[in-house]
Each structure stands twice: as C-alpha cells, then as structure tokens.
C-alpha cells in the first residue's frame, strides 16, 4: 500500500522537510502532488512524467518545492503555512491511479532566551529570588537547569505562569550556581546563557583555633599564642579582635609572641558582613600559667549572634 | 611603628622590565596583604594587584595580567612587583600598601612611592 | 569591574563651610567604600572605612555616609589643612578601583 513518511514530522520554520513515497506501484508513469488531503486541481504543487523526467508546476507551487524521481517531495525554508496535509497521486500506466496522503507540522523557529531576575545577590533566609525566562511563546515547554542539571525537588522552589517564572523561597547558601532555562517545542530547543545566583551569607558563629608554638597541651609562660579565627561567610567577613574588650588588629590570625600571665582574659574573635548586615563574634577565656601545667583554652566558651 | 619603605627611582627604556621592593616592619608581615597601586603624573590612583605573604597567593587587575609578578620574601619581609613590557604610559608613581585588616578592607599605611619613568 | 565615579572633580570653599563630596558605584558595594586623602606631593591617607567608620586619629569634622551605591564624604568646617584631593575606593573585593579624586581649595 502506498504510504507518505514525512521526515522529519515536527519541522522548525526555515528549515526544510522531505515528504517521502514508499510502496509505489510498478507501472508508475507519473506523480502529482497536492496540498491537502484530497486530488483538487487548484491544490496541484507539481506534476511529473517519469518518461521524460519533467516537472510541471501547478497553481499551489511557491517555488520552495523540489520533486524526486522516487516521488520524493523537499520543501524548503518552511512556512508555518505550510503546515499540513500532503496528498500524491501516483498515475499509473493502466489508469487506476493510487492516492495516499501525509503531513508535517511547522512549528516557529525559538529564538534564543534570556533570564531576568529581581535579585541576583540575595541574603540568605531573607530575600525570595525570581527568575522569569523571556520571552513568551506560545505552545512552547519551560525547563529550568541548575549548575548544569534538572531542577532538584524542593518545597522551596516554585514554578508558574506555564514555568516561565522560577521563585526560590528563602534562598539558602546551597542555591548558589548557575541558572539556565531552555524553551522547547516538538521541533526545536534553546537554551539561555547562564545567570550566576550569589548568595550572600553569614558570617556564621566563628571558630578560634588554638595553635600553640612549641605545641603543647597547656599555656605556659613563654610560648607563642596563634590564635586563628574562621567564619563561613559570603562576602568574606571583616575579622576584628578584642582583648578583654581592647579593640586590637583586624586580622583572621592574632598572634603573641612570648605570652606571660599578664596575657590572661576574654579574646573575642568579631566577623562582619556589610553585605548581609550581620555580625558575629566568639569569645574564648584564656589563662598562662608561670609554670607547671595550667588548663589553657577554658572550656566555657561561648559566642554571641547579632543581627 | 609600621613601616613600608620602598625601593628608589628607576629610569627605563620601553620594552624594558622594572622590579620595585617594599620592606616591611613594625608588624607581623605574613598577617596583613599588601597591594600595588600607582599613580601617573597628575593623575588618580590605580590598583595593581595585591600578594598574601603568608601563601605568596596573588591577584592581579586585568590590566596588568600578563605584565605584573608580585612575589614576597619572608625572611626579609619584603615584597616585589615587576613589570615587564614597559611603554612610556607605565610612567608612575608605584605605592605599596598594607590592607587594614584581611577581606573587605582598604589599605592603612602606603609606603613613600617610587618613581618609574620610562623614556627612550 | 565596578566603577567609581566622583563630583564635582574640584570645589573651592571659604574656611569654615560645609564641604561634600559624592562617589557612586556602578553596582552595590553595600558599605565596603573607603575615603583617602592626598595632599600635594604626599602618599594617600585613608580617612574613612566601611563608608562610616572614622580611622583612629583623624578628625572628627570628617563624616562619611551612604550605602549601596551612593556615598557622601562630608568635613564640616573646612579648614587651611584640608587642602588636598580626596578619592573614594570600594573595598568590596578585587579588583580595587578608585573615584577619579576631588580637588579641595581655599577661596
């Protein structure tokens, strides 16, 4: 039976489909071809004699359209238009003619997307981010990427307006990365250029790491103090030091060299993120002994959080 | 007190490469970064680059990248800047400066410059 | 890069008046904005920090203000010393770049 295979079936605009016979009867003399789904002379796009290999043009023939020996038809640089039907009738030498009829679908070609948000530095368990994927086209799929894959399952992540728009609730450190979305339809896709979410933080609770040198397990009078202190934070945290409440040097690292007893107190280790409008601090008690062995970093340690 | 004393004034041809030192005293030199900035005649400041001498960890602005090498000797608490390549627009006044604190802070204390002319 | 842009680029005032200076940024810095000043044939002195904070030893006529992109050095009464160029610098991460400087004079 004589069949119609459109390749490809879903056609993006600008690009073209070949509508190919399969089938054909062996006492073929000729073909035409219509748009449509029935033989109408006003549809005829081109007619063909197999003896002489000549191609007629009909009334329905744009110019874009090229016919084969084996029956083929190419239609170039399609239309939406052009979606459709598609009917050959094949002619044969006893005049029983065959008729069978395909289709294609012209879907409009996607131009490239971009993604706009409303906030590409938010502060973590404050600022709610949206990113919208432009522009709208009809009949199309949204989908989203995250740092190179699909989107992860999250209550904290919402998509609507038919997934053109991505809202990240709450945003935490985590959601940092790249952001694409891509637009699809059955006969073509575009991805957007990559949008970096940075995702201010902190500073968290600091740490203070001991380091004694020589190293040993108690603070004895005549060793060196390397006190170093860390804070997860984005931007990078403002390091400041107080000794018993004295403003000291600004640096992640405090060093003393030589400690005595004089050297006992509070050392309280601040951060600062301007960014997020966050401080933290961290204060550890500190005791030298003369000699002998003496308990070092106290054990009650404690921090204080502000906002 | 801190101190950052630089190296003297240098003439160079085009094409030529300058090194400029910057001793450091009065501080714990591995615990604060220090930074290049220049200033042409009459003109604003330009940041260069900055090293951690701590890591000997730099950065460069884009400008430089390619012509500038920042590296330190701790055992002398110095650091130098080079600059390879030099035109006649390299003319300047190369400051070094200490960061106030680390991350996020500008520069406390500048060393008292050094002039690089460069002229065929 | 960020940008930083200063005005005016020069003010002359009479001893005694209310002086200001403003530098914006091309993007948020949120506070990270320093203040330095330069008086001729001298190395650059930082005045201000974290758009607010007044360095040790500097004069309290000095104030700065502003946050993300717009800030304001401000000397309440100018005096013969102040004479000099004033630039603005972000210290929101590398790459540092600077205002294009004040000039301050005396009429």
């Known amino acids: 039976k004589l069949t119609i295979e459109s390749t490809p079936f879903n056609v993006a605009e600008g690009k073209e489909v070949l509508l190919l016979a399969h089938n054909l009867p062996q006492n073929r003399i000729g073909y035409s071809w219509y748009k449509g789904e029935r033989v109408d002379g006003n549809s005829l796009i081109v007619g063909y004699v197999i003896g002489t290999q000549q191609a007629t043009p009909g009334p329905a023939y744009s110019g874009r359209e090229t016919i084969y020996p084996n029956a083929s038809l190419l239609i170039q640089n399609v239309t939406q238009n052009d979606t459709g039907f598609y009917t050959l009738q094949v002619i044969k030498s006893d005049l029983v003619n065959e008729e069978a009829t395909g289709q294609f679908h012209v879907y409009p070609e996607l131009p490239k997307p971009s993604i706009s948000s409303n906030n590409s530095n938010p502060v973590e368990d404050k600022d709610a981010v949206a990113f919208t994927c432009e522009p709208e086209v009809q009949n199309t799929t949204y989908l989203w990427w995250v740092n190179g894959q699909s989107l992860p399952v999250s209550p904290r992540l919402q998509l609507s307006n038919g997934n053109m728009t991505l809202t990240l609730l709450s945003v935490k450190r985590n959601d940092a990365g790249s952001y694409e979305c891509e637009i699809q339809n059955p006969a073509s896709a575009n991805r957007s250029d990559p949008v970096t979410l940075n995702v201010l933080y902190g500073p968290d609770v600091p740490t203070i790491s001991p380091i004694i040198s020589p190293p040993d397990s108690s603070y004895l009078s005549g060793a060196n103090l390397n006190l170093s202190c860390h804070s997860a934070s984005n931007p990078s945290p403002q390091y400041s030091w107080r000794i018993n409440g004295i403003p000291q040097q600004h640096t992640q690292v405090l060093f003393i060299a030589k400690i005595t007893p004089n050297n006992n107190g509070t050392y309280a280790c601040f951060v600062s993120n301007l960014a997020t409008g966050r401080n933290n601090s961290i204060v550890k008690s500190i005791t030298v002994s003369a000699s002998g062995t003496s308990p070092g970093l106290s054990a009650g340690a404690h921090h204080h959080h502000h906002h | 007190q801190v101190q950052l004393v630089q190296s003297g004034a240098e003439v160079k041809k085009p094409g030529a490469s300058v090194k400029v030192s910057c001793k450091a005293s009065?501080?714990?030199?591995?615990?604060?970064?220090l930074h290049w900035v220049r200033q042409a005649p009459g003109q604003g400041l330009e940041w260069i680059g900055y090293?951690?001498?701590?890591?000997?960890?730099?950065s460069y602005a884009q400008k430089f990248q390619g012509r500038v090498t920042m590296t330190r000797d701790t055992s002398t608490s110095t650091v130098y800047m080079e600059l390879s390549s030099l035109r006649s627009e390299d003319t300047a006044v190369y400051y070094c400066?200490?960061?106030?604190?680390?991350?996020?802070?500008?520069?406390?204390?500048w060393g008292q410059g050094t002039l690089v002319t460069v002229s065929s | 890069d960020i940008q930083m842009t200063q005005s005016p680029s020069s003010l002359s005032a009479s001893v005694g008046d209310r002086v200001t200076i403003t530098c914006r940024a091309s993007?948020?810095?949120?506070?990270?904005l320093a203040w330095y000043q330069q008086k001729p044939g001298k190395v650059p002195k930082l005045l201000i920090y974290?758009?607010?904070n007044l360095v040790e030893g500097v004069p309290s006529r000095f104030s700065g203000s502003g946050s993300g992109t717009d800030f304001t050095l401000t000397i309440s009464s100018l005096q013969p010393e102040d004479v000099a160029t004033y630039y603005c610098?972000?210290?929101?991460?590398?790459?540092?770049?600077f205002g294009q400087g004040t000039k301050v004079e005396i009429k």
């Open positions: 400066a200490r960061e106030y604190g680390n991350y996020n802070y500008p520069l406390d204390y």
């Open positions: 993007e948020n810095i949120y506070g990270y």
């Open positions: 009065g501080y714990i030199f591995t615990s604060y970064w």
């Open positions: 610098q972000h210290h929101y991460g590398t790459p540092y770049t």
């Open positions: 090293i951690n001498p701590q890591t000997g960890y730099t």
């Open positions: 974290n758009a607010k």
